[in-house]
């Protein structure tokens, strides 16, 4: 369930505008069990931010992280 009390995180909103790329150190995808697909970016301050995987900037950041 997307609302279960386990440690499977799910996102219910997406960040509206891009984060500075330099602030992001890693990312992960949320589970397919979640009601909304999401990419979670982790910042250098260990903050976790939900992003829409369909957005161009999100895909570009993922590609950049994969290459670094």
């Amino acid at each position: 369930s997307p609302y279960s009390s386990d440690t499977t995180p799910c996102c219910f909103a997406y960040i509206a505008r891009p984060l500075p790329r330099a602030h992001i150190k890693e990312y992960f995808y949320t589970s397919g069990k979640c009601s909304n697909p999401a990419v979670v970016f982790v910042t250098r301050k260990n903050r976790q931010v939900c992003a829409n995987p369909e957005k161009k900037w999100v895909r570009e950041y993922i590609n950049s992280l994969e290459m670094s």
Epitope: P9, C11, F12, Y14, I15, T30, N46, R47, Q48, V49
Partner: nanobody, 124 residues
Framework: EVQLVESGGGLVQAGGSLRLSCAAS????????IGWFRQVPGKERKGVSC????????YYEDSVKGRFTISSDNAKNTIYLQMNSLKPEDTAVYYC?????????????????WGQGTQVTVSS
């Protein structure tokens, strides 16, 4: 075991007040922001408010600003949502939620733990 237990919901007339509580256990309180989401039948849960346990930073959704106040009692690992000037459109099930580590990007932060929810009904 992680637990978030809400209480304080109920039926109230428009213009009235309620105070919701969320008692947290089973995880390090300072590592999470605790927030409130609400859900009406057939719609997605929406983030209403959030407080960072570590520094007290808060977030309020626009429709509740000036009416709702979130606070924490770290000694009791409990978060409160004081809801004043309630409107019929505030009617929903209110859920307590835990998201790491603070409210900077709330509600665009992943939710790791949920409470069971408490019903708030505002009659006109």
């Amino acid at each position: 075991e992680v637990q978030l237990v809400e209480s304080g919901g109920g039926l109230v007339q428009a213009g009235g007040s309620l105070r919701l509580s969320c008692a947290a256990s089973g995880f390090t309180f300072d590592d999470y922001a605790i927030g409130w989401f609400r859900q009406v039948p057939g719609k997605e849960r929406k983030g209403v408010s959030c407080i960072s346990s570590s520094d007290g930073t808060t977030y309020y959704e626009d429709s509740v600003k000036g009416r709702f106040t979130i606070s924490s009692d770290n000694a009791k690992n409990t978060i409160y949502l004081q809801m004043n000037s309630l409107k019929p459109e505030d009617t929903a099930v209110y859920y307590c939620a835990a998201a790491p580590p603070d409210c900077t990007y709330y509600p665009a932060t992943p939710i790791y733990y949920w409470g069971q929810g408490t019903q708030v009904t505002v009659s006109s």
